[in-house]
Amino acid sequence: APISSHCRLDKSNFQQPYITNRTFMLAKEASLADNNTDVRLIGEKLFHGVSMSERCYLMKQVLNFTLEEVLFPQSDRFQPYMQEVVPFLARLSNRLSTCHIEGDDLHIQRNVQKLKDTVKKLGESGEIKAIGELDLLFMSLRNACI
């Protein structure tokens, strides 16, 4: 089970209208450049077999991957939203740095790995798709971690 006190974000992180709006605008803009509507990254397959109490840890993994492998490499695109949203998400990642789970997390890593593999397989269009799903990432973090 998670060390739940560390797998928590204050709800105030998700109640800032400006940065919430910028996050959703970034997702919307990227989704207009995403032509692959058949593939979904954040959805029931990601959460399958993961208990509610483990989902913040799961979303921490997805957030870190998205920052390191998607947003940082694409940081020159989708301005001005990107330059505001990336630091916001990086702060959330930092606040979740002590979120761990005790025991076996293989089922979680398996689900996250499938997401990573999908993004990598699609190449740049996978990265665009991940940016286009930042609204879902935001909502998933909020639902799982507050």
């Epitope: 959703f24 997702a27 919307k28 989704s31 207009l32 995403d34 509507t37 058949d38 979904r40 954040i42 959805g43 029931e44 959460f47 399958h48 208990s51 509610m52 109490s53 286009g132 799903e133 609204d135 879902l136 935001f138 909502m139 998933s140 639902n143 507050i146």
Partner: antibody, heavy 119, light 108 residues
Framework: EVQLVQSGAEVKKPGASVKVSCQAS????????IHWVRQTPGQGFEWMGW????????RYAQKFQGWVTMTRDMSNTTAYMELPRLRDDDTAVYYC????????????WGQGTLVTVSS | QSVLTQPPSVSVAPGKTATITCGGN??????VHWYQQRPGQAPVLVIY???DRPSGIPERFSGSRSGNTATLTISRVEAGDEADFYC???????????FGGGTKLTVL
């Protein structure tokens, strides 16, 4: 079999309150959000909010914020929706439904509870 | 504010194919779900994520999407398919699900 079973029909006077229950079975109750959605002939479907059975956390539609209360009892795997200060236009069929992520399709619905508000 | 538009009614002869559309402004990156509601009953999920079918739903039910229009297709229509059909998306900007107004399918 996965199912959500709701309490029976209610007739209430304006100004009264109603509490509808939704008992879950056949799956791990804590792993799915329970949403409440009402349906009226004029307005169609109207989402009211959800409760996270694992934490008791809630998220309400703006219209129902400060009005509706959604709770759950883990011991009997039941979610509740309480609506005080009923008005005539709250007459509707109230459904509970589950979803996995908080923003996914409602894959299982309760059978519905008709709440009639009439003086 | 995103609004989902469905035709109020669709009529089809048994054995033929029924198509029900759902139009929405800017749901390019939204996932569209479809529910069937028979008279006096609760809705049943028949298609999710645009085109996926839950277990137990006949293969005759399929979904697709092109641009801002999603389509539910029911092939080899049977009398028992007569019901109201609703499309739904989760609107992240208002953080709530939006439902179409419903389409009444009549089997002639």
């Amino acid at each position: 079999e996965v199912q959500l079973v709701q309490s029976g029909a209610e007739v209430k006077k304006p100004g009264a309150s109603v509490k509808v229950s939704c008992q879950a079975s056949g799956y791990t109750f804590s792993d799915y959000y329970i949403h409440w959605v009402r349906q009226t002939p004029g307005q169609g479907f109207e989402w009211m909010g959800w409760v996270n059975p694992d934490t008791g956390g809630t998220r309400y539609a703006q219209k129902f914020q400060g009005w509706v209360t959604m709770t759950r009892d883990m011991s009997n795997t039941t979610a509740y929706m309480e609506l005080p200060r009923l008005r005539d236009d709250d007459t509707a069929v109230y459904y509970c439904a589950r979803d996995l992520t908080g923003f996914d399709p409602f894959d299982i619905w309760g059978q519905g509870t008709l709440v009639t508000v009439s003086s | 504010q995103s609004v989902l538009t469905q035709p109020p009614s669709v009529s089809v002869a048994p054995g033929k194919t029924a198509t029900i559309t759902c139009g929405g402004n800017n749901f390019r990156n939204k996932r569209v779900h479809w529910y069937q509601q028979r008279p006096g009953q609760a809705p049943v999920l028949v298609i999710y994520y645009d085109s996926d079918r839950p277990s137990g739903i006949p293969e005759r039910f399929s979904g697709s999407r092109s641009g801002n229009t999603a389509t539910l297709t029911i092939s080899r229509v049977e009398a028992g398919d007569e019901a109201d059909f609703y499309c739904q998306v989760w609107d992240s900007s208002t953080d709530r699900p939006l439902f179409g107004g419903g389409t009444k399918l009549t089997v002639l």
